[in-house]
């Protein structure tokens, strides 16, 4: 069959999902990109376990995950539903600050150094988490 | 052997239809994102489309969104191009390629076909 | 989209001889970039990716240096099968390109 049973190499399993942390920064776009063309998606927080979890890996350094509002309401990128799920905003954000002069506001949710969440302009350079659930699809290609 | 073999190319008139096929051998084809790029005569590479192993996320230039179609056989290792709409500016060698994942979250074309001609013409 | 300049357009050197070519971004690309060749006829090879990483079977005297805008590849002893068109590429944002390429040939 075509279902993935376990993770790629360098992809780490937790409670039934596949997780690959970047060492490097992209766009939010340009990581959303990245993810689906790996049969992923940017990483949907449901949990404080989940959230825990993330912090973990990815340490004290700003980090996308698939959170936005570039389109009005904020969305997870997998249909997860915002205002009835987990959240762990900063205190006061999300704020869509205009005040940083890149023109717009802030439409990209990402883990601060702290974990908690923060609002920040799509086009910044942040590294990334992908998620993809097991037994969904083809397992992810191994490295060059 | 590991290698990729397109077919289907030739001549069509401008607004006809092609449909480009890559046989991948020698790899486990559904666990990589595929790729096809374009090269005119004379001139330098540029990407056409991509696709994820599975085949749920395509992604396409813009010079050929609306147009062309990536799509992707696994159960026959065959990777897809469906050109409608063409161009004279669509004339080119088509390559089929593997995109290779790294460490750092960069997608590079780590293997290639040897291509297959495309000529739009009246 | 990001442009990729790559310059020289021609390297006219001798076999022995050192080459260094030089690809530059219209923005920052961080390390996501690539190098292939490609001879009369053939399909582009891969070289080097994520800037300085040599992929499978690339012999030692082809590296890759630079971050952000500006990139170099360098062969450090050019043998008589290294005469071909060399291109960079980009994989930080979306669409990936390709930069218009140098040709190396002979003197």
């Known amino acids: 069959g075509s279902e993935r049973t376990c993770c790629p190499v360098n992809w780490v399993e937790h409670e039934r999902s596949c997780y690959w942390f970047s060492r490097s920064g992209k766009a939010w776009a340009d990581a959303d990109n990245y993810c689906r063309l790996e049969d992923a998606h940017l990483v949907v927080v449901t949990s404080w376990e989940e959230q825990k979890f993330v912090q973990h890996h990815i340490g004290p350094v700003n980090t996308w995950m698939g959170l936005h509002d570039q389109n009005g309401p904020w969305k997870w990128v997998d249909g997860t539903d915002y205002e009835t799920g987990f959240k762990n905003w900063r205190p006061e954000q999300p704020d869509d600050w205009y005040g940083h002069g890149l023109g717009g506001g802030e439409d990209c949710a990402h883990f601060t150094d702290d974990g908690r969440w923060n609002d920040d302009v799509c086009q910044r350079p942040y590294r990334w988490v992908c998620e993809t659930e097991l037994d969904k699809a083809s397992q992810e290609p191994p490295l060059l | 052997e590991v290698q990729l073999l397109e077919s289907g190319g030739g001549l069509v008139q401008p607004g006809g239809s092609l449909r480009l096929s890559c046989a991948a051998s020698g790899f486990t084809f559904n666990n990589y994102p595929m790729s096809w790029v374009r090269q005119a005569p004379g001139k330098g590479l540029e990407w056409v489309s991509a696709?994820?192993?599975?085949?749920?996320?395509?992604f396409y230039a813009d010079s050929v969104k609306g147009r062309f179609t990536i799509s992707r056989d696994n159960s026959k290792n065959t990777l897809y191009l469906q050109m409608n709409s063409l161009r004279a500016e669509d004339t080119a060698v088509y390559y089929c390629?593997?995109?290779?994942?790294?460490?750092?979250?960069?997608?590079?074309?780590?293997?290639w076909g040897r291509g297959t001609l495309v000529t739009v013409s009246s | 989209e990001i442009v990729l300049t790559q310059s020289p357009a021609t390297l006219s050197l001798s076999p022995g001889e050192r080459a260094t070519l030089s690809c530059r971004a219209s923005q920052s690309v961080s390390s996501y970039l690539a190098w292939y060749q490609q001879k009369p006829g053939q399909a582009p090879r891969l070289l080097i990716y994520d800037a300085s990483k040599r992929a499978t079977g690339i012999p030692a005297r082809f590296s890759g240096s630079g971050s952000g805008t500006d990139f170099t590849l360098t062969i450090s002893s050019l043998e008589p099968e290294d005469f071909a068109v060399y291109y960079c590429q980009q994989d930080s944002n979306h669409p990936l390109t390709f930069g218009g390429g140098t040709k190396v040939e002979i003197k």
């Open positions: 390629a593997k995109l290779g994942t790294t460490v750092s979250g960069g997608h590079y074309f780590d293997l």
């Open positions: 696709i994820s192993g599975s085949g749920s996320a395509t």
